[in-house]
Interface confidence: low
């Protein structure tokens, strides 16, 4: 009686079981009452990833440097092409399917956490008592220069942008 | 700057071994194929072989018994040899990037094969 | 090896004619084919790869089409400076002792 269900990596068609295709080959032809199933490897630039019953194999991921990416890990018949981005620019999605520049900290923030290849720059406004009066992807808040330990005093308070002048005491006769 | 440039002897001899570098920059060998391809004076583009990422090796029919390409990560360079060669292996030898997709191109360097 | 059979060899053609150069693979390369473009003196060009994909840089004038072993490059418009040779160059590859690769004999386009 023919099989309702096939055993793991097999597949049912025309009422028999066929073994699937191992990963990095793609299907020719199924089997017969006399022959094993036909598989034929992928191309240089394809793949698949799975055991299969796919006729075509999926060609690899380009990294298109017009979009800012760069190959992270080439693809085997086995594996898709891994993109990431060049210096400077992160991905714009999990899939990285291009690439947009880091994000610079405009004056009044500092950045909390440095760009990736996968993740923008995290910037956080410049609490009291510190002050950036840069527009940086990297550069932190910085703390307002203490007068005190310089024997100044503050002439001009500091602002999350600026950071406090100072001055000399006012000597009294 | 992402480029590759051959180098190596303009006129080799009869019955001689041709040996070509291929240096790049810019980018990993480990992670790229490369390829030499030649092309006698006034004809058409021939594929020599190539050299994979990991390693291996892939050499046209007619070259197999004579070709060796080899490289070195370290050195950021691929090497070309070419054993027993004769007037018809006269020809500009370029090192690219690639195995079907040739993307990056040397200038080329022109051999001569003479006595 | 595989056999890339381009035609034609030459072409005569003039500024803004449609232009059509077809290559014949020896046997299923499924979309493994770029084109070249080659001036004189220099090392060949990407044009395309795969089939039909635009390299970049390269003006969307230039199209290509096919799969398996048809294939070809169309220049919508040809300019002054398409006047070159085209070359096609295809493969497969299944493992280290069996795979094949390949340029066609490439189409030379003349001004008329």
């Known amino acids: 009686e023919p099989p309702t269900a096939c055993r793991e990596k097999q597949y049912l068609i025309n009422s028999q079981c066929c073994s699937l295709c191992q990963p990095g080959q793609k299907l020719v032809s199924d089997c017969t009452e006399f022959t094993e199933t036909e598989c034929l490897p992928c191309s240089e630039s394809e793949f698949l990833d799975t055991w299969n019953r796919e006729t075509r194999c999926h060609q690899h991921k380009y990294c298109d440097p017009n979009l800012g990416l760069q190959v992270q890990q080439k693809g085997t018949s086995e594996t898709d092409t891994i993109c990431t981005c060049e210096e400077g620019l992160h991905c714009t999605s999990e899939s990285c399917e291009s690439c947009v520049p880091h994000r610079s900290c405009l004056p009044g923030f500092g950045v909390k956490q440095i760009a990736t290849g996968v993740s923008d720059t995290i910037c956080e406004p410049c609490p009291v008592g510190f002050f950036s009066n840069v527009s940086s992807a990297f550069e932190k808040c910085r703390p307002w220069t203490s007068c005190e330990t310089k024997d100044l005093v503050v002439q001009q308070a500091g602002t999350n942008k600026t950071d406090v002048v100072c001055g000399p005491q006012d000597r009294q006769r | 700057q992402v480029q590759v440039q051959e180098s190596g002897p303009g006129l080799v001899k009869p019955s001689d071994t041709l040996s070509l570098t291929c240096t790049v920059s810019g980018f990993s060998l480990s992670s790229y194929d490369m390829s030499w391809i030649r092309q006698p004076p006034g004809k058409g583009l021939e594929w020599i072989g190539a050299?994979?990422?990991?390693?291996?090796?892939y050499y046209a029919s007619w070259a197999k018994s004579r070709v060796t390409i080899s490289v070195d990560t370290s050195l950021n360079q691929v090497s070309l040899k070419l054993s027993s060669v004769t007037a018809a292996d006269t020809a500009v030898y370029y090192c690219a990037r690639g195995w079907t997709r040739l993307d990056l191109w040397g200038q080329g360097t022109l051999v001569t094969v003479s006595s | 090896d595989i056999q890339l059979t381009q035609s034609p060899s030459f072409l005569s053609a003039s500024v803004g004619d449609r232009v059509t150069i077809t290559c014949q693979a020896s046997e299923d390369i499924s979309s493994n084919l770029a084109w070249y473009q080659q001036k004189p003196g220099k090392p060949p060009k990407l044009l395309i790869f795969?089939?039909?994909n635009l390299a970049s840089g390269v003006p969307s004038r230039f199209s290509g089409s096919g799969s398996g072993t048809e294939f070809t490059l169309t220049i919508s418009s040809l300019q002054p400076e398409d006047f070159a040779t085209y070359y096609c160059?295809?493969?497969?590859?299944?493992?280290?002792?069996?795979f094949g690769q390949g340029f066609g004999g490439g189409t030379k386009v003349e001004i008329k």
């Open positions: 160059q295809g493969g497969y590859w299944t493992s280290t002792s069996n």
């Open positions: 050299i994979g990422g990991a390693g291996g090796t």
């Open positions: 795969p089939a039909s």
